[in-house]
């Protein structure tokens, strides 16, 4: 999906209002310095591409993020403010359902959510030069 035509300011507002709080809740008990940010993004469409990938695509050691509260709200925000997004997800979700594992919070998931927090922070500061 090409995130170029999304309403970035409304997605940002939804993130600041509630999605960010859900990410913090998920990470509660974890030190903010515990994980290094290894995933980066260069502009808002790129950030949303990385956010969508880390949130909804199962990875080795962390197959369960798509059912978390922050993921549900992320999906809602992208569907509401990115034209045509929800229609593009139909085939992707059917494939994911077959691979979905039992919901377990692993250290790998915590690391992945830490990366997500970094991507979201970068999304909110689009004018900063890439580190």
């Amino acid at each position: 999906y090409d995130f170029t035509n999304c309403d970035f300011e409304k997605i940002k507002a939804a993130y600041l209002s509630t999605i960010s709080k859900d990410l913090i809740t998920y990470m509660s008990g974890t030190k903010s310095t515990e994980f290094n940010n290894t995933v980066s993004c260069s502009n808002r469409p790129h950030c949303l591409t990385e956010i969508q990938s880390l949130t909804f695509n199962p990875t080795a050691g962390c197959a369960s993020l798509a059912k978390e509260m922050f993921a549900m709200k992320t999906k809602a925000a992208l569907a509401i403010w990115c034209p045509g997004y929800s229609e593009t997800q139909i085939n992707a979700t059917q494939a994911m359902k077959k691979r979905r594992k039992r919901k377990v919070t692993t250290n790998k998931c915590l690391e992945q959510v830490s990366q997500l927090q970094g991507l979201w922070r970068r999304f909110n500061r689009p004018l900063l030069k890439q580190q």
């Epitope: 507002a13 209002s17 509630t18 059912k67 809602a76 509401i80 997004y85 929800s86 229609e87 139909i90």
Partner: antibody, heavy 122, light 108 residues
Framework: QVQLVQSGAEVKKPGASVKVSCKSS????????MNWVRQAPGQGLEWMGQ????????TYNGNFKGRVTMTRDTSTSTVYMELSSLRSEDTAVYYC???????????????WGQGTTVTVSS | EIVMTQSPATLSVSPGERATLSCSVS???????LHWYQQKPGQSPRPWIF???NLASGIPARFSGSGSGTEFTLTISSLQSEDFAVYYC?????????FGGGTKVEIK
Amino acid sequence: QVQLVQSGAEVKKPGASVKVSCKSSGYAFSSYWMNWVRQAPGQGLEWMGQIFPGDGDTTYNGNFKGRVTMTRDTSTSTVYMELSSLRSEDTAVYYCARSGFDYGYFYAMDYWGQGTTVTVSS
Amino acid sequence: EIVMTQSPATLSVSPGERATLSCSVSSSISSSNLHWYQQKPGQSPRPWIFGTSNLASGIPARFSGSGSGTEFTLTISSLQSEDFAVYYCQQWSSYPLTFGGGTKVEIK
């Protein structure tokens, strides 16, 4: 304007199943999660689960132990909630409720259907 | 499962008086994930307050919400006849989503 119109009242025997529909209009149906909430006579509200019409993704309340199934028909902008193995305690008003971001970007159930009364009686 | 406990179950108030409704949450949640709904007999619930303190569209300013962590409050500064109803708090912090048992505000 956003409207959620539910199917009519149902009377069912214990052990049977019921399927309630909720037809949406006035917004992009595929883009908003739809919840089902029930209310037994004189009681409070109980969340049953939700479905994302865009891809059929669902999240259910474990209290219903596999008895509830939510589906959607994008061609008619309708979501369905089927509850099986009915018992008398399932007698309730069943509501569909869209969830979305309000003007302050808080996420909540912003529009509700009119409710469908389901009576389970032998 | 997060348990929401509302008190009192019934609040008897005279028109013009102040009403304070409480919602206690079994584990701490973000204030952005606590909402209030109003329901009148024979009607569907209506969104009333979003994110602890933000009034839904068209809700009069005599209503206010406050709180954080595990304790939240809905206050009606001067009750009007149309305010008599049941009010439910609800959390959107974790699954399953849960509601409080409701507080019925009735005419004294």
